[in-house]
């Protein structure tokens, strides 16, 4: 008996079609994606083929204005325009509070959305009751398939679940769930889940009874042959882990941001053993026409996204310096404002030891790309914060050690004074440079905010312990020249959008009056 | 071969009630959604109930809600239709008719043969 | 509720002829469109799903197109067995409606 699964995971509310690279289409004839041109590709092939199945591995939520505005809203619709068979929730469906995951989502979906690892309690438990499962058994053609979904646990660090979520441990979790399905007479089973490619291969090493992984959260491209765009391949698809048990586990991921659709045909025995798996991410690129019926829906949705982007966010009663003159150069508030943003949409009170689990960011200054002027009545609108932050990125979580940041630090003046982007804009950062050292030893102090304290204060940097920082997902895969950050990092997440985030911070606080205030310094 | 066979149909006064049946083989009958459908004499298709897969939903036309109830027995590969208050216009040809697998709204590929119902004083 | 207008309400053709039947919804319906080919006395049998797939066992002379609102059955060359009538029917969101059909007859 064969399935066609194919797969999405971490789209990110690119609904409309992108660019090669993710970002805003500029040039139609060149762009990608969408759900438009999904919804023709995934009918080609339900049209073809008897046993289908369309899944979705998690973070949808979050990545462009369309999430800003419609909050989840265009996830269920579109998703349920394109007939999704089951989800499984990501760290983002959380960004705006289990009651943002729950109304817009949870409600409207007519496809099941899943995670074994997540538990409810208190009120909460019976309020979500029912409206996310474990797993869920759907029939396809004569027989039925198990689908187990999961998260990552790390999700309370990443986004917004509250106190009444609990994030278990996902093979811990997992495992009852596959024996309850395995008691139904399931003997074939797939795991959909969001924790990263390399909890996806420990499920499939691990989980008794899994016989497919489809993943999420580390974008993850997997391609065999010669891959058709830019991405490069971290392994063959599907990848094959070997199960303590014996068993030959495919596991696949299909990159992000809707640019491919995985396409994975699996071969079962009577027994529901997996006895062959193949195929490949397709890349949705132009040669796939996009449906006339999704596009006009899409263009109706649309309007809504113009009118938003005039819009008064807040007020801003100083000049914000974006130029590249000042954030190339020295601190600029800009960079501030960009930073001060970036911790508070990472608050978190994790426990009664720390303050919060983060407090340092990092932001190139060629990443800035204009000022805002507050003479214009001081208003800011998307459509400004658009023009400071283009390119469409996410400020983003990782984990680095001390010596790793103190290189960071070395090559943001490694050639200072030539206007290049490297220079870093900080938050939570005490740095003073000398120029007249000579490059790579030109750090001669390094304060960083402590979490582990009621009252924060800067301590020296120490080279051996591990820092969690906010920056530009740029930054996290060594652009600018951060090699070091990409080699070196122990953990990264991806965080929410960097217009979203500022535009958030800006909206909440009002009136904001950003100042340059001695966070990097010249001796 | 996949088959659906319709029974229960015959002549009933107004007011009345009628139960239908339909018996379902060859295929996994509690993987498939479920329908009715029904075609009054020299008239069209009119479509009357769905019944999901995993009974968890079913959907009626607003002109037999609350009169008909559509319901299933996946043990025994049967599909019903309960009709109370029977009216005149409710007179047709009743199909069962297979739908698709999931919770979305779905086409028929199998259809069966049809049973005559006709609501007469 | 999504209103299916089919036109022509009939037709006469000849054996061979080329028949084109449309149906137009009173909102988009993607490609949610069924055609179906009844006989008289006869159950209604499926010929094509998502608007333009051919039912398995279905004769390639019967083709379907469309999207959106506006969909078209074709019968390239229509063979005596094809004088029938014949229904669209949309599964975009309930309830489920048909179109009044094309009876197609011979000229």
């Known amino acids: 008996w064969e399935l066609t699964i194919l797969h999405t995971n971490d789209v990110h509310s690119r609904l409309e079609q992108t660019s090669e690279d993710s970002s805003k289409c500029v040039n139609a004839s060149r762009c990608m994606g969408g759900v438009a041109r999904l919804f023709t590709k995934v009918q080609q092939i339900r049209r073809a083929e008897p046993n289908v199945l369309l899944l979705d591995a998690g973070d949808q939520y979050q990545g462009t204005i369309w999430f800003t505005v419609y909050k989840g809203a265009e996830v269920a619709h579109f998703m349920n325009a394109l007939r999704y068979d089951a989800m499984a929730l990501g760290n983002h469906e959380f960004d705006n509070g289990v009651e943002g995951l729950i109304e817009p989502l949870l409600k409207e979906a007519k496809f099941p959305i899943l995670s074994a690892n997540i538990k409810a309690k208190g009120p909460l438990a019976s309020q979500i009751s029912g409206l996310y499962l474990p797993y869920k058994v759907l029939p396809v053609g004569d027989e039925v398939v198990g689908i187990v979904g999961y998260t990552s646990k790390e999700t309370p660090f990443l986004s917004n679940p509250g106190t009444n979520l609990v994030f278990e441990d996902e093979i811990t979790a997992l495992q009852p769930e596959v024996d309850k399905l395995k008691t139904l007479n399931v003997n074939k089973i797939i795991a959909l889940g969001h924790s990263g490619f390399e909890t996806d291969k420990l499920i499939a090493q691990k989980v008794r009874g899994v016989d497919v992984v489809v993943g999420g959260h580390s974008n993850t491209f997997l391609y065999t042959g010669n891959p058709p765009s830019k991405e490069v391949p971290a392994g063959k698809y599907p990848f094959i882990v070997t199960s303590d048990d014996g068993r030959k586990v495919p596991v696949v991921q299909a990159y992000a941001f809707g640019k491919y659709l995985g396409y994975l045909k699996i071969e079962f025995d009577e027994r529901g053993n997996v006895i062959s798996s193949h195929g490949n991410p397709i890349l949705l690129n132009s040669s796939i026409p996009e449906d006339p019926s999704i596009k006009a829906d899409i263009n109706k949705w649309r309007i809504k996204l113009d009118n938003y982007s005039t819009q008064e966010l807040g007020k801003t009663i100083v000049y914000l310096d974006g130029s590249s003159q000042s954030c190339r150069f020295r601190e600029c508030n800009m960079g501030n404002l960009i930073c001060d943003a970036m911790i508070n949409n990472n608050l978190r009170h994790a426990d009664e030891m720390f303050w919060n689990h983060v407090s340092m960011c990092i932001l190139n200054g060629g990443g800035i790309r204009s000022p805002i002027d507050e003479r214009n009545n001081g208003t800011i609108t998307w459509e400004n914060l658009a023009a400071v932050l283009p390119f469409g990125g996410t400020f983003d979580l990782v984990q680095l050690k001390g010596s790793t940041l103190k290189k960071a630090f070395e090559h943001s003046v490694h050639r200072y004074g030539q206007s290049t982007g490297e220079f870093l804009q900080v938050g939570g950062i005490h740095v003073v440079y000398d120029l007249s050292r000579k490059p790579g030893d030109r750090v001669v102090k390094l304060d960083v905010l402590c979490t582990k304290c009621r009252v924060p204060s800067y301590d020296p940097l120490k080279m051996d312990e591990i820092y969690k920082v906010i920056l530009p997902n740029f930054l996290a895969n060594g652009g600018d020249g951060f090699q070091m950050i990409k080699d070196e990092l122990l953990r990264h997440d991806s965080g929410d959008q960097d217009i979203n985030v500022v535009s958030t911070y800006i909206s909440k606080m009002k009136v904001i009056y950003p100042a340059v205030e001695g966070r990097i310094k010249f001796s | 071969q996949v088959q659906l066979v319709e029974s229960g149909g015959g002549v009933v006064q107004p007011g009345r009630s009628l139960r239908l049946s339909c018996a379902a083989s060859?295929?996994?009958?509690?993987?498939?959604?479920m329908h009715w459908v029904r075609q009054a004499p020299g008239k069209g298709l009119e479509w009357v109930a769905v019944?999901?897969?995993?009974?968890?939903?079913?959907y009626y036309p607003d002109s037999v809600k609350g009169r008909f109830t559509i319901s299933r027995d996946n043990s025994k590969n049967t599909l019903y239709l309960q009709m109370n208050s029977l009216r005149a216009e409710d007179t047709a040809v009743y199909y069962c008719?297979?739908?698709?697998?999931?919770?979305?709204?779905?086409?028929?590929?199998?259809w069966g043969q049809g049973t005559m119902v006709t609501v007469s004083s | 509720d999504i209103q299916m207008t089919q036109s022509p309400s009939s037709l006469s053709a000849s054996v061979g002829d080329r028949v084109t039947i449309t149906c137009r919804a009173s909102?988009?319906?993607?490609?949610?469109l069924a055609w179906y080919q009844q006989k008289p006395e006869k159950a209604p049998k499926s010929l094509i799903y998502a608007a333009s797939s051919l039912q398995s066992g279905v004769p390639s002379r019967f083709s379907g197109s469309g999207s959106g609102t506006d969909f078209t059955l074709t019968i390239s060359s229509l063979q005596p067995e094809d004088f029938a009538t014949y229904y669209c029917q949309q599964y975009n969101s309930y309830p489920l409606t048909f179109g009044g059909g094309t009876k197609v007859e011979i000229k």
């Open positions: 909102q988009g319906i993607s490609s949610w």
């Open positions: 008719a297979r739908g698709g697998s999931s919770w979305y709204p779905d086409s028929f590929d199998i």
């Open positions: 060859g295929f996994t009958f509690s993987n498939y959604g």
């Open positions: 019944i999901w897969y995993d009974e968890s939903n079913k």
